[in-house]
Amino acid sequence: KFSKQSWGLENEALIVRCPRQGKPSYTVDWYYSQTNKSIPTQERNRVFASGQLLKFLPAAVADSGIYTCIVRSPTFNRTGYANVTIYKKQSDCNVPDYLMYSTVSGSEKNSKIYCPTIDLYNWTAPLEWFKNCQALQGSRYRAHKSFLVIDNVMTEDAGDYTCKFIHNENGANYSVTATRSFTVKDEQGFSLFPVIGAPAQNEIKEVEIGKNANLTCSACFGKGTQFLAAVLWQLNGTKITDFGEPRIQQEEGQNQSFSNGLACLDMVLRIADVKEEDLLLQYDCLALNLHGLRRHTVRLSRKNPIDHHSIYC
């Protein structure tokens, strides 16, 4: 867990993050494990430490080895290990398995390929993308931020995709490449504008003062795995966490259920010890995905403890 494999190509930039994460204020010391020699922090060095990051600008095959990072808080020191391997550049087109990042899957509706490790680097758009060493051209391919989008994905789009970008450090530019496999799932999924199953729009929920009450926000977003979908509650237009009433909490986590093949989510709002002032609040069940946002509003009304039906003579 706290030993992480990292790899790169000679003469390219490689930046490695300490596998032992800490708060931003903590100091991090880096050592070359074999010699216990401290890694310098001065940026004039080809290999230097910069907080949580260890930078090889550029990397050399001889840099391969295990590096130790010690994260220091005021009272605790915690250790991580980065196992770095730098490979010689291949003369041919094939990318060996040991240089491949994790495989990603796509489908007709969701075909994003993220460029691995790019968040560690200081890069500027656009990314260059290659498939099996060929530069990608044509309107079906769109390089967007740190990912590639392929329109109308077909099974022939499966293959090895390489992203190439430039890392800038103090005015100097270094090339970085990263490759991962892309597989295509034949998935008949689809995404819809959210449909809220509960609560009904402008529903009045009867509650008893002093008792606990639960409100469930339930919505469906289409069929199959959804790329982005969420349900949440708001109080008077404010997020629950920002509202500041500890009696009112959203149930932790969201469970994705597939009833009738539909992808649905629900979020339970728990109100402990219902008070009079809770009846004055507006409770909004929000469901959102890439298509947009739908909102159903609920209000609470007082339920008499003895709720006899009226008897008409």
Epitope: Q21, G22, E252
Partner: antibody, heavy 123, light 107 residues
């Protein structure tokens, strides 16, 4: 000096509610994850709940999920545990404790503990 | 959830003797394991974190070892103030869990 002081314990009937507080001092409360741990009389320690420093993510033991709510007021340096639908098996000393390290998605040890407050659920 | 099993339940030793306490996890916790000491009427006190690191102010006679599923707390030479209950705790994932405790008592 780091100090945690629990309050709000007492005798309550089954089905009743209680709200525990933990007043923190001697450290920057808002950046630390906070935890409730309980210990039934003569028994071992049981983790109850964790809340992240910024107050966003919360985690609960299955035994209290849906009945207990952890919250915090960073402006008052105070941690809370709202306990509803109390049962006899909730009888315990409740400790609040600090996690001195955690980053989102991870947990760590408990380096400072309060002295505990006793909650007794009995009719 | 990850179950931690401590053994023995009770350890009867004399001051100056070596104490060896065991904690076994139902699945790997890497080195995300801590040891606490608790005396009657007091809150627990952190002794060891990340399986083998002593917390600030903890005497050198306390040491921890192990990784994965098997862990050991060793007290090299028991002092009178070391007689207490000791708990292990994993923090690799929620729910955080504790062992049931080992009581170290005076023989």
């Amino acid at each position: 000096e780091v100090q945690l002081l629990e309050s709000g314990g007492g005798l309550v009937q089954p089905g009743g509610s209680l709200r525990l507080s933990c007043a923190a001092s001697g450290f920057t409360f808002s950046i630390y994850d906070m935890i409730w741990v309980r210990q039934a009389p003569g028994k071992g320690l049981e983790w109850v709940s964790t809340i992240r420093g910024e107050g966003g993510s919360t985690y609960y033991a299955d035994s209290v999920k849906g009945r207990f709510t952890i919250s915090r007021d960073n402006s008052k340096n105070t941690l809370y545990l709202q306990m509803n639908s109390l049962r006899a098996e909730d009888t315990a000393v409740y400790y609040c404790a600090r996690d001195p390290w955690s980053t989102e998605g991870s947990f760590f040890v408990l380096d400072y503990w309060g002295q505990g407050t006793l909650v007794t659920v009995s009719s | 959830e990850i179950v931690l099993t401590q053994s023995p339940a009770t350890l009867s030793l004399s001051p100056g003797e070596r104490a060896t306490l065991s904690c076994r996890a139902s699945q790997s916790v890497d080195d995300d394991l801590a040891w606490y000491q608790q005396k009657p009427g007091q809150a627990p006190r952190l002794l060891i974190y990340d399986a083998s690191n002593r917390a600030t102010g903890i005497p050198a006679r306390f040491s921890g070892s192990g990784s994965g599923t098997d862990f050991t707390l060793t007290i090299s030479s028991l002092e009178p103030e070391d007689f207490a209950v000791y708990y292990c705790q994993q923090y690799i994932t929620a729910p955080l869990t504790f062992g049931q405790g080992t009581k170290v008592e005076i023989k």
